[in-house]
Interface confidence: low
């Protein structure tokens, strides 16, 4: 196992005196129900907790809310519910946080059943004021920012109407009816579907996709036949019904809608779904559902058009629309993700990809643990992480795998090191290389976090007993020390600590209960005398991204360019700081096929890096779909995978001529398309 | 101390053969990338070809290629330049230089040099 | 490949005097510069790396700066042991590695 406090680790030095001088304890004066927490704005240190209590009285729900607000980051709460008159907020709502540093807090007010519509408590000035206002609907959904103005919201109101406020929820506009969904685009635009006929559901395949640009003073249909739609980077998708069955297909769009292209990706039916599993500007990771009740699909990366897909991943576990998925986003390193597949056996087993979909392999057995039961063969088997599906699934897993992308190459999880995933108690991981090595960090289930851009580590064991135990290192995890921050332990119910990992500030959650009483309570820990100095240039050592092959000049190209980094030695106890950034230097690497995805009409056989015609396309002309019209494509195969940057090197071309014949296939051609003014 | 060491530098005809080396010391020599550089008489630096730390990469200038062949002996601590077909153009100081950071880190500044030694091709 | 341009070719100045030298590369090379001095008769020595930082044993009256295509070498205070000539060299990781044509520092 990880080494723990022994002569290998170096303790931190008069720690105990160091944190019990910035521990600060708020009890809460509530009955305990829920709690909900939200960070107002970055680096300010401002803090809303929602505390709600409900009674459930013989004809009716009683219910209770206090609002607190820290401006220390959680050291001292103040209760400003008299600022929201003592109004009941609807949790289901939440709290909506205004982007950016806007300073805005809407809150949604729980209203008598007779009343005109609903109410909300604003403040654009980082909850200090609020101002009541009351609505001309009763929302449906939480209001809704502009990314681009914050002054902008929307929100759908319980009879299916799109409201619109351009001047921070003062006053309302209801610029469109039987709306099923809406959505922001960029440059202020909104996107939604609208039912002709009976509801969102009886119309599902039939609706219409509508866009306004200037917040409902005109609108424009951009698609019909629509089943559902969904924004992922640059891209606009839609899933469209096919003309003559119930199959739907999916069409994509780069111009906000003004021009559509079929995506070559297979058509699914009505029990099938796809799933925009993370987009960026250069491309999407797709997945397919398969047909019938199979519990997993395919995985597809797009091109820079969103149009052409190449399989990534088969058999990738995801349960049912809107289910469970273990699909990940490795923030601290670039072109890394971790999924799960389900195996011909049934068993679940964890991929990893560095190259943004391009190959999943396993992830590699931690040099300190042994493989588990369910390995054949107890020499060789693999780590496997608990995500979504397995906390879905009532495993013993507290989190689901943590990142950071100013923590560097760190990542963190629950996993078991087997040939699949095991449902005993696991244990925690650490990679400090952006998963290509994992460690045994922690012996079993822990909530963790990452402060200081990854120059600190916090865990808490995850226990059924009250906790009054916390777990930190400075090391990425190498050695612990444990500190006592309470004498009387609480329920644990969370760690909390500012989005961003830069602060130093964490607050752990939970409740006391006595034998007539349980009341919310937070102990916030400060480690910044732990960290006594900044850090400076000899704290930082040079590494180089997915080095696998120290020898190569290539070695760490990852879509077609390599980057070095300086990070924090795990040696040196000091602080990043708030302001701390990533330094990295990027280099341009010289192209290889491994640089480019089969274009269309091409695949690549299994273990080979040549694309080769597909034998059902060979001696055909290739022509796609492509804005509404027939093109040709003369290609020798490749495709520059988005967003690489590669120079030189392999060069294989590529030419497109315009067939100027319309598709068929294409529902969403431009002549379908109107516009209309209100 | 990290010294490196040429040899083998002289006079030759148009058209011949010379081999130079390169003896290292002070460093795990089998750690990391090397290199040769030349300089023409009263000219600037050229880089001539690299080789990774256990010969599976090399890379050659496009003045040289097909001409000269790098080569290392780890066992030896030795470095090698065979240089054929030599052109008058070829005349220079040749220095040996490591990179300076070990295997993992492929960003090319030199450091340090050895003392150089003058291969002078002239009929 | 990628061409370095170093300015001035020569340059005549006085102990204590601030010189300036200049480095182009005819496309972006990101931070990878470094910049070595050379004596009469003595090999190259590895100044600067990365753009801006200074190899250890270096005097720190020895700086870098720049980014993407344009670099620069300064000496914020000449002395006599400086008079020498400056190479600026790409460091991408990639062959061919090129440097520029050199600048000589000379006694004014």
């Known amino acids: 196992s990880a080494p723990g406090e022994d002569e290998e680790c170096g303790r931190v030095r008069d720690f105990v005196a160091k944190l019990a001088n910035n521990t600060h304890q708020h009890v809460f004066d509530d009955l305990r129900g829920s709690v909900s927490l939200s960070w107002v704005g970055d680096s300010t240190g401002v803090i809303l907790v929602l505390t709600t209590f409900h009674v459930p009285l013989v004809i009716m729900t009683f219910g209770q809310s206090k609002l607190y607000r820290s401006e220390d980051y959680g050291k001292n709460f103040k209760d400003i519910t008299d600022l929201i008159n003592n109004t009941f907020i609807r949790t289901e709502f939440g709290m909506a946080i205004g982007p950016e540093n806007s300073g805005k807090v809407v809150l949604t007010a729980e209203v008598s059943g007779g009343s005109r519509g609903g109410r909300i408590f604003r403040s654009s000035d980082f909850a200090k004021n609020f101002v009541q206002t009351d609505l001309p609907f009763h929302p449906l959904t939480q209001m809704m920012y502009s990314p681009q103005n914050s002054d902008y919201l929307l929100a759908l109101s319980t009879e299916n109407g799109l409201w619109v406020s351009k001047n921070f929820g003062g006053k309302w506009e209801e610029i469109h009816k039987a709306v099923c969904l809406a959505k922001w685009g960029s440059d202020n635009t909104i996107f939604f579907t609208t039912y002709a006929n009976g509801s969102c559901k009886a119309d599902l395949g039939a609706l219409e996709l509508w866009r306004t640009s200037d917040l409902g003073k005109s609108f424009k249909t951009i698609g019909v036949k629509i089943y559902s739609f969904g924004l992922g980077g640059r891209f606009l998708f839609a899933s469209v019904m096919a003309d003559k069955d119930t199959t739907r297909r999916i069409h994509v769009s780069t111009d906000q809608g003004d021009t559509w292209s079929m995506a070559q990706l297979p058509s699914v039916g009505q029990e099938q779904f796809y799933s925009i599993l993370a987009a960026n500007d250069d491309m999407v990771f797709m997945h397919v559902d398969e047909p019938g009740d199979t519990g997993f699909g395919t995985i597809f990366t797009s091109d820079d058009r969103g149009i052409v897909y190449s399989k990534s991943l088969d058999r990738h576990l995801y349960t049912t629309t809107g289910g469970e998925t273990d699909f990940t986003n490795v923030t601290s390193l670039r072109g890394v993700y971790i999924t799960s597949v389900l195996s011909e056996d049934n068993s679940i087993q964890t991929m990893i990809t560095f190259d943004q979909g391009g190959r999943w392999t396993h992830l590699r057995k931690p040099e300190n643990s042994e493989c588990d039961a369910t390995a054949k063969n107890k020499n060789e088997c693999s780590l496997h992480i608990h995500a979504s599906y397995s906390i879905s699934q009532k495993l013993n897993v507290p989190m689901a795998p943590l990142s950071e992308p100013n923590a560097v190459g760190i990542v963190i999880a629950h996993g078991s090191v087997g040939d699949a995933i095991s449902v005993m108690v696991p244990d925690v991981y650490i990679s400090d290389d952006g998963g290509y090595s994992w460690t045994k960090m922690l012996e079993g289930p822990h909530y963790y976090t990452i402060l200081d851009s990854g120059g600190i580590i916090v865990a808490i064991e995850h226990s059924s007993r009250p906790i009054n135990v916390i777990k930190f290192s400075t090391d990425e995890g190498q050695c612990w020390q444990t500190y006592t921050f309470t004498r009387d332990p609480i329920y644990f119910t969370g760690l909390a600590s500012e989005p961003g990992a830069r602060s130093m500030n964490i607050s752990i959650w939970g409740f006391t209960e006595s034998f007539l009483t349980s009341q919310w309570v937070s102990y916030t820990i400060d480690f910044k005398d732990i960290l006594e100095r900044n850090c400076e240039e000899k704290d930082y050592t040079i590494w180089l991204a997915h080095s696998t092959d120290p020898e190569d000049y290539e070695d760490g190209c990852i879509l077609g360019y390599k980057e070095q980094f300086l990070r924090l030695r795990k040696s040196s106890v000091c602080q990043n700081g708030r302001d701390y950034v990533v330094t990295k230097q990027p280099s341009i690497c010289l192209c290889s096929l491994e640089d480019f995805l089969c274009d269309f009409g091409y695949y690549r056989p299994e273990n080979d890096s040549k694309c080769v015609e597909q034998p059902e396309l060979k001696g055909h002309d290739l022509e796609f779909c492509l804005y509404g019209r027939e093109e040709h494509l003369t290609t020798n195969g490749y495709r520059k995978i988005p967003g690489d940057k590669c120079q030189g090197g392999v060069n294989p071309v590529r030419e497109v001529k315009d067939l100027k014949k319309k598709c068929t296939s294409n529902f969403l051609s431009p002549e379908k398309q109107n516009s209309k003014s209100n | 101390e990290v010294q490196l060491v040429e040899s083998g530098g002289g006079l030759v005809k148009p058209g011949g053969s010379l081999r130079l080396s390169c003896a290292a010391s002070g460093f795990t020599f089998s750690s990391y990338s090397m290199n040769w550089v030349r300089q023409a008489p009263g000219k600037g630096l050229e880089w001539v070809s690299s080789?990774?730390?256990?010969?599976?990469?090399?890379y050659y200038a496009d003045s040289v290629k097909g001409r000269f062949t790098i080569s290392r002996d780890n066992a030896k601590n030795s470095l090698y330049l065979q240089m054929n077909s030599l052109r008058a153009e070829d005349t220079a100081v040749y220095y040996c230089?490591?990179?300076?950071?070990?295997?993992?880190?492929?960003?090319?500044?030199?450091?340090?040099w050895g003392q150089g030694t003058l291969v002078t091709v002239s009929s | 490949d990628i061409q370095m341009t170093q300015s001035p070719s020569s340059v005549s100045a006085s102990v204590g005097d601030r010189v300036t030298i200049t480095c182009r590369a005819s496309q972006g090379i990101d931070s990878w510069l470094a910049w070595y001095q050379q004596k009469p008769g003595k090999a190259p020595k590895l100044l600067i790396y990365?753009?801006?930082s200074l190899q250890s044993g270096v005097p720190s009256r020895f700086s870098g700066s720049g980014s993407g295509t344009d670099f620069t070498l300064t000496i914020s205070s000449l002395q006599p042991e400086d008079f020498a000539t400056y190479y600026c060299?790409?460091?991408?990781?990639?062959?061919?590695?090129?440097f520029g044509g050199g600048t000589k520092v000379e006694i004014k």
């Open positions: 060299q790409q460091g991408n990781s990639l062959p061919p590695i090129t």
């Open positions: 080789i990774s730390s256990s010969s599976s990469y090399i």
């Open positions: 990365a753009a801006s």
């Open positions: 230089a490591r990179d300076r950071l070990g295997r993992g880190y492929k960003w090319n500044w030199f450091d340090p």
